[in-house]
């Protein structure tokens, strides 16, 4: 798997999408994990629904949001209010039994806001009741890492 | 802003059907869940089926099985329940709702009375 | 299928106290669990989803908590327009079930 850098600006949101193949992952509900280290385990940030058929349903674990369009075939994870802490690799994955596919790798770079001169005590910080819908989705840069570029910095 | 608009109450007859209608302003039609849910004088809520935009037809609690169907019509942004040989303790305020994000029930019709009466 | 048993079936408070609503599950719902509020003569109005997160324009005196079987519905300080009935409900398995309600009546 390719790894597709998706790009936010710190303190909005950004939409990160995964295609798949729905005949092939039919029936199967998806997850977003974040790498711990190149080699550690994808640990789970949400998933889709417990009922497949309603996967179209927004599933939210804090400031993350997961929605499926499982007809279309697009894993869709919303990242409200980025934040640095939100660098990272992360995988779309479809899951069946214990087991997991890997749908996606993805890298989330957080880029600061030139826009914003204010002190961080002014930072705009979304209420809990406010809606994953109503959110400003950032459009986000993507592009897939380059061959021989290197997804995870080498540990000295 | 979303709003779901039912059709008037309803009186019937025993063994006899009545078919209620939600309309939908705002938002796509077609790609949120209509659902059913009633509740009869005095009771609590019971969810009897919905239309869910990934199975593209109609799925329904097991104890209306057979007697209710639930359809869309697109072209006019609205739903129908339809139930069928009628009895008394069918006698409930019957609702729709939609989904927004989160749940099959985010936002809700005003509700329908259908009195079942001899 | 799912039974939700709420508790208690009638709570008497005054304006102004704290009312704390229990909604057990027969199995392990996971945290999907919402909760309504309704009025007489109205539609049910969504409050909580996912056990904890309060609905779009929901006051911060509402707030859910819980996980697996039992949940807890906590309104911090009763107002006027908070006397009402309120319905625990799950998602996790079919079919889709509610609670039999709890009713927040004024003392």
């Known amino acids: 798997h390719n790894t597709t850098v998706f790009q936010g600006v710190e303190g909005q949101s950004l939409q990160v999408s995964c295609p798949y193949d729905s005949m092939k992952h039919w029936g199967r509900r998806k997850a977003w994990c974040r790498q711990l280290g190149e080699k550690g385990p994808c640990q789970r940030v949400v998933s889709t629904h417990n009922l497949w058929l309603l996967s179209f349903l927004r599933r939210r674990n804090g400031s993350t949001a997961i929605t499926d369009d499982t007809l279309g075939g697009t894993l869709t994870i919303t990242l409200r209010n980025l934040q640095p802490h939100d660098a990272g690799f992360y995988q779309c994955q479809s899951l069946h039994g214990s087991e997991a596919d890997t749908l996606r790798k993805v890298l989330v770079e957080v880029l600061a806001d030139p826009l914003d001169h204010r002190d961080a005590g002014d930072l705009w910080v979304p209420g809990e009741s406010e809606s994953f819908e109503d959110a400003h989705v950032e459009h986000s840069i993507s592009r897939s890492l380059l061959e021989g570029e290197i997804p995870f910095p080498p540990t000295s | 802003q979303v709003q779901l608009v039912q059709s008037g109450a309803e009186v019937k007859k025993p063994g006899s059907s009545v078919k209620v209608s939600c309309k939908a302003s705002g938002g796509t039609f077609s790609s949120y869940a209509i659902s059913w849910v009633r509740q009869a004088p005095g009771q609590g809520l019971e969810w009897m089926g919905g239309?869910?935009?990934?199975?593209?037809?109609?799925n329904y609690a097991q104890k209306f099985q057979g007697r209710v169907t639930i359809t869309a019509d697109e072209s006019t942004s609205t739903a129908y329940m339809e139930l069928s040989s009628l009895r008394s303790e069918d006698t409930a305020v019957y609702y729709c709702?939609?989904?927004?994000?989160?749940?099959?029930?985010?936002?809700w019709g005003q509700g329908t009375m259908v009195t079942v009466s001899s | 299928e799912i039974v939700l048993t709420q508790s208690p079936a009638t709570l008497s408070l005054s304006p102004g106290e704290r009312a704390t609503l229990s909604c057990r599950a027969s199995q392990s719902v996971s945290s999907y669990l919402a909760w309504f509020q309704q009025k007489p003569g109205q539609a049910p109005r969504l409050l909580i989803y996912?056990?904890?997160n309060r609905a779009t324009g929901i006051p911060a005196r509402f707030s859910g908590s819980g996980s697996g079987t039992d949940f807890t519905l906590t309104i911090s300080s009763l107002e006027p327009e908070d006397f009402a009935v309120y319905y625990c409900q799950q998602d996790f398995h079919w079919p889709i079930t509610f609670g039999g309600g709890t009713k927040v009546e004024i003392k």
């Open positions: 996912d056990a904890s």
């Open positions: 709702a939609r989904t927004q994000e989160y749940t099959l029930f985010d936002i």
């Open positions: 239309i869910i935009p990934i199975s593209g037809t109609a």
